[in-house]
């Protein structure tokens, strides 16, 4: 099995994790994709997934997780808004391709959320963003029931993450609905 690497991201409560997972668009554009958490001693658990087949650039929101699959670019964007300390953990993007096992990323995201004032929700001082609106979408997709194995032999997508941080206009549409829904069971 290929050894998986991980990258550590330290964010503050209220900020937004923004992960970009690259994939080969000719192969996987319409494939269903998912965002998973990996807890110690457990199989990866799917927290949110795109529709099947995945719709181009159509946001899917599950609680505070928003997925956007850009077929034209071969890029799955995953955002976790209004981060909480309990969101800390190990995450990954996967591509479902039944009946085969899901493709997983080599670079997993080690998210560490700490307490501390971060300005307005989802912001900090390093922003280059001037408009940020959490979409009011409530679209949800049914995710496959099976979980992914730990071993990996191939991983076409690649992922990175950054803090999405507004600095002037903030319009948190339906934010109360978003932050009330827990990410985890």
């Amino acid at each position: 099995a290929t050894k998986l690497t991980e990258e550590k991201y330290e964010l503050k409560e209220g900020q937004t994790l923004d992960v970009k997972c690259d994939y080969t668009l000719e192969k996987f554009a319409s494939s269903q994709k998912a965002w998973q958490i990996i807890r110690d001693g457990e199989m990866p658990k799917t927290l949110a997934c795109t529709e099947r087949p995945s719709k181009n650039s159509h946001p899917v929101q599950v609680g505070r997780i928003i997925l956007e699959d850009y077929h034209d670019h071969g890029l799955l964007r995953v955002r976790m808004v209004n981060l909480q300390v309990e969101d800390s953990g190990l995450y990954q993007c996967v591509i479902y391709q039944p009946p085969k096992e899901p493709h997983m990323l080599f670079d997993r995201i080690r998210l560490v959320v700490t307490k501390g004032f971060s300005g307005t929700p989802g912001s900090n001082e390093n922003s280059t963003q001037n408009v940020y609106k959490i979409p009011p979408t409530t679209t949800k997709a049914l995710c496959p029931l099976y979980t992914s194995p730990r071993t990996v032999t191939q991983a076409p997508p690649k992922s990175t993450a950054d803090v999405s941080t507004p600095d002037s206009e903030i319009n948190l549409t339906n934010v109360t609905d978003i932050i009330r829904v827990p990410v985890f069971n």
Epitope: K20, D22, D72, H73, Q129, K158, T160, D162
Partner: antibody, heavy 116, light 107 residues
Framework: EVQLVESGGGLVQPGGSLRLSCAAS????????MSWVRQAPGKGLDWVAS????????YYVESVKGRFTISRDNAKNSLHLQMNSLRAEDTAVYYC?????????WGQGTLVTVSS | EIVMTQSPATLSVSPGERATLSCRAS??????LAWYQQKPGQAPRLLIY???IRATGIPARFSGSGSGTEFTLTISSLQSEDFAVYYC?????????FGGGTKVEIK
């Protein structure tokens, strides 16, 4: 075939304004992030600004914040860059590009010259 | 801001030879790294994204590798049409930043 055609470039004095436009065709404009990237004569590439499909997210490079405004009209498949308070260092070829993070398709560019 | 540094600034290679271009990031960009080719008087063209995924229509002689802070673009056997300037670009964090470019010229 993806086509991006820029217009609106020209010679302007320091402190002046210009509005660049980009006509897009050959793809679903309303489903794509769009950006502007510039290239000063004989120099490398510099990202300027990006805008999401519905304009709910907009990003600028620090050097143009407060002076440039990126906008789009999905009904007309057009992208715009309003440039105010222009400086000599804004002189460049401005490219309209498809994508918000990396850039799959590029126009041929329009030259903006800021000089007195 | 993540600073991207490319080396060498100029690479002199004979047709048919292998060319290896380097790109270094000032901090990790994981795999969110793209490579572009630009010929004189033309707009840039996307070659590689995700550090190693070839863009649509790009010949197999172009390959990318690396992760984190060190990346490489390899052209296995240079064709006459490959002599151009090559740029790397990170898209992990805003602001998006490009390297200064590597000019691949005929030896």
């Amino acid at each position: 075939e993806v086509q991006l055609v820029e217009s609106g470039g020209g010679l302007v004095q320091p402190g002046g304004s210009l509005r660049l436009s980009c006509a897009a065709s050959g793809f679903t404009f309303s489903s794509n992030w769009m950006s502007w990237v510039r290239q000063a004569p004989g120099k490398g590439l510099d990202w300027v600004a990006s805008i999401k499909q519905d304009a709910s997210e907009i990003y600028y490079v620090e050097s143009v914040k407060g002076r440039f405004t990126i906008s789009r009209d999905n009904a007309k498949n057009s992208l715009h860059l309003q440039m105010n308070s222009l400086r000599a260092e804004d002189t460049a070829v401005y490219y309209c590009v498809r994508g918000g993070w990396r850039f799959e398709s590029w126009g041929q560019g329009t030259l903006v010259t800021v000089s007195s | 801001e993540i600073v991207m540094t490319q080396s060498p600034a100029t690479l002199s290679v004979s047709p048919g030879e292998r060319a290896t271009l380097s790109c270094r990031a000032s901090q990790s960009v994981s795999s969110n790294l793209a490579w572009y080719q630009q010929k004189p008087g033309q707009a840039p063209r996307l070659l590689i994204y995700g550090a190693s995924i070839r863009a649509t229509g790009i010949p197999a002689r172009f390959s990318g590798s690396g992760s984190g802070t060190e990346f490489t673009l390899t052209i296995s056997s240079l064709q006459s049409e490959d002599f151009a300037v090559y740029y790397c670009q990170q898209y992990k964090n805003w602001p998006l930043t490009f390297g200064g470019g590597t000019k691949v010229e005929i030896k």
